[in-house]
Amino acid sequence: FERTRSLQDPCSNCPAGTFCDNNRNQICSPCPPNSFSSAGGQRTCDICRQCKGVFRTRKECSSTSNAECDCTPGFHCLGAGCSMCEQDCKQGQELTKKGCKDCCFGTFNDQKRGICRPWTNCSLDGKSVLVNGTKERDVVCGPSPADLSPGASSVTPPAPAREPGHSPQ
């Protein structure tokens, strides 16, 4: 079947990094500078992505693969293949319509990206606040007030609360 297909379509013999040049009797020609073909049998090469401005080059373009970009310091990638760069904010801030703004009282953000989330309400679980929340950190909930009565066993600090930031990708 492969031989038959090759006879019918000479372009199928052109490997990645080349294109089937109609102007030269369907000869396999190398991709010109700043272009690539990642699969065989292509009739054109694709233009390499250029990482300009807030984008910087993470991987150079080759004849068989596109360039890959990431973001300059102070920005982070968004979208598939880092299609956009978005401004970092400080911990304790979030990116709003008007740029980076401090988290409002009662909310926190432990990352340079993402949004401010409300502090955990310890009392909903019958617990008390062991460590107050800040703009950068959630509250830490401790034992219920009843557990802290005289004669109760000593308090073991709880494991650090898992902040609500998204997991790293």
Partner: antibody
């Protein structure tokens, strides 16, 4: 493909509790917050609360604090919403929805919704 | 918590342009997202950020924002656009809030 599949309809008596499940698939369960939103018959949408499947952080709307509990089971990629002390006004469609996130700008939007679970509270 | 206000009902002639608005103090800080809901169906995200459309949403849908008002515009409304439309935003307490919804009728 990305899906949120909710449990079936429930009929409950006033004062009882209901637990609705939302099974996720097609993406990394730990990466996206899940919200719960309800809609009474013929009415608008009402936000109930949020859970971060990675770590279990929760935050609830003031209207529901003390009556709602959101939990998750990472082994089955399922999120649960339990509402207690049910009254007739809790008769509604309950939706789970995924918060737009992952490696996309966090624009406070819900990009994927479950099909809804009808909860009827009647004596 | 803050409130978002929408007109309860809006109508538009087939092929014409319609704008659905959403007002609230939280919109001075945060962008709104917009959902389309047809009878018997779950809500569908049609716009987020200021003017970002999820894949599969026709480009006749567009978004804009000014001050405390967010707008969803449908340019060349089609019969299939008849639905309820809800805006949504966070408020400064970190909660989310929905507008009351706008019923769009395509004449």
């Amino acid at each position: 493909q990305v899906q949120l599949v909710q449990s079936g309809a429930e009929v409950k008596k006033p004062g009882a509790s209901v637990k609705v499940s939302c099974k996720t698939s097609g993406y990394n369960f730990n990466t996206y917050y899940i919200h719960w939103v309800r809609q009474a018959p013929g009415q608008g949408l009402e936000w109930m609360g949020i859970i971060n499947p990675s770590g279990g952080y929760t935050s609830y709307a003031q209207n529901f604090q003390g009556r709602v509990t959101m939990t998750r089971d990472t082994s089955t990629s399922t999120v649960y919403m339990e509402l207690s002390s049910l009254r007739s006004e809790d008769t509604a469609l309950y939706y789970c929805a995924r918060e737009l996130g992952g490696n996309v700008r966090r624009d406070d939007a819900f990009d994927i919704w479950g099909q809804g679970t009808m909860v009827t509270v009647s004596s | 918590s803050s409130e978002l206000t929408q007109d309860p009902a809006v109508s538009v002639a087939l092929g014409q342009t319609v704008r659905i608005t959403c007002q609230g103090d939280s919109l001075r800080r945060y962008y709104a997202s917009w959902y389309q809901q047809k009878p018997g169906q779950a809500p569908l995200l049609v716009m987020f950020g200021e003017d970002k459309r999820p894949s599969g949403i026709p480009d006749r849908f567009s978004g804009s924002s000014s001050g405390n008002t967010a707008s969803l515009t449908i340019t060349g409304a089609q019969a299939e656009d008849e639905a309820d439309y809800y805006c949504n935003s966070r408020d400064t307490s970190g909660s989310w809030v929905f507008g009351g919804g706008t019923k769009l009728t395509v004449l």
